[in-house]
């Protein structure tokens, strides 16, 4: 039985050209996290964080994605095309797969405030 829940940074906004941290946290389960995958709105993989082996940033994103903090991901040099959904997929044993959703809005305005709050999707 899957008892865990994923908390995420929820809906966030950030300035074009800036950076943003995507964060998820799995709680309420004793399952072992074997891998966390970060995916973009078009379902392309951004990065994989393997519990034993560390980070693999996908070749297409190496210049704009930085691992961490923790199991999170930092997107840099944001463009308007980065607006959309992001997913953290926790692969666990023996529970199976947990998935969290974050919506990022990239704003042109120089007054765009980076909002980040933890919420359960």
């Amino acid at each position: 039985m899957m008892t865990g829940t994923i908390e995420t940074t929820g809906n966030i906004s950030a300035k074009k050209g800036g950076s943003v941290i995507l964060q998820c946290h799995l709680s309420s389960t004793m399952a072992q996290v074997t891998q966390v995958n970060w995916e973009q709105h078009d379902h392309s993989l951004l990065a994989i964080r393997n519990a034993e082996l560390g980070w693999h940033i996908y070749p297409a994103f190496k210049d704009r994605v930085a691992p961490g903090p923790g199991l999170g991901l930092t997107l840099q040099s944001l463009t308007m095309n980065d607006t959309g959904e992001y997913f953290c997929t926790y692969h666990t044993y023996p529970d199976g797969t947990y998935r969290g959703r974050i919506f990022l809005e990239v704003l042109e305005s120089s007054v765009a405030e980076h909002s980040a709050r933890f919420q359960i999707p």
Epitope: N37, H43, S44, L45, N50, E52, L53, W55, H56
Partner: antibody, heavy 120, light 107 residues
């Protein structure tokens, strides 16, 4: 260049423990991931598990209760132990390196493989 | 576990002609797929990673494509040295799993 060489008995009796060692040259096993993969006769490849640069291990759940992967950093080698073997464990066993940072879960260096037959 | 199903099981190709191998995942693995070639009497060798990136030293006649559940390895012009068994592998989730293999022969 990274080179891997498997060694161990080619014949193991049923219910006994299969033990193999992989000697690594040209690279330190305190970097990257060191894997065991097997190939039963006429079949595909099966991941057994790996030991990481820090010594942490991951085992395929289908074999987890019978597998131990360990390492000896002073000899730059790592080992596989598979207990309670049956004829189904007859296979070519490969040791392999995986550079997770650059290639994800894709294996970039393989040993030449060693054939292990389980038979009385 | 994710099952990787390869088709065809075998392929006989005239030198200089193209060849295509398909790999289907039992669930969405995004682009976390690698391809290997196991030449006769040898260990597997990495050809493609991340679905479409050629590994160092792999000739450009080899190309990988696909995402989600459907992946393809193409050889634009098959050469005699390309014979062997080709395997796909997913690393989207553990345990990482391989396809059953496709044997490529020369006519």
């Amino acid at each position: 260049e990274v080179q891997l060489q498997e060694s161990g008995p080619g014949l193991v009796k049923p219910s006994e423990t299969l033990s193999l060692t992989c000697a690594v040259s040209g690279y330190s096993i305190t970097s990257d991931s060191w894997n065991w993969i097997r190939q039963p006769p006429g079949k595909g490849l099966e991941w057994i598990g790996y030991i990481s640069y820090s010594g942490n291990t991951y085992y395929n759940p289908s074999l987890k209760s019978r597998v131990t992967i360990s390492r000896d950093t002073s000899k730059n080698q790592f080992s596989l132990k598979l207990s309670s073997v049956t004829a189904a464990d007859t296979a070519v066993y490969y040791c392999a390196r995986l550079d997770f940072s650059n290639y994800g879960g894709a294996v970039d260096y393989w040993g030449q493989g060693t054939t292990v037959t389980v038979s009385s | 576990d994710i099952v990787m199903t390869q088709t065809p099981l075998s392929l006989s190709v005239t030198p200089g002609q193209p060849a295509s191998i398909s790999c289907k995942a039992s669930q969405n693995v995004r682009t976390a797929v690698a391809w290997y070639l196991q030449k006769p009497g040898q260990s597997p060798q990495l050809m493609i990673y991340s679905a479409s990136y050629r590994y160092t030293g792999v000739p450009d006649r080899f190309s990988g494509s696909g995402s989600g559940t459907d992946f393809t390895l193409k050889i634009s012009r098959v050469e005699a040295e390309d014979v062997g068994v080709y395997y796909c592998q997913q690393y989207y989730t553990t345990p990482w799993t391989f396809g059953g293999g496709t044997k490529v022969e020369i006519k």
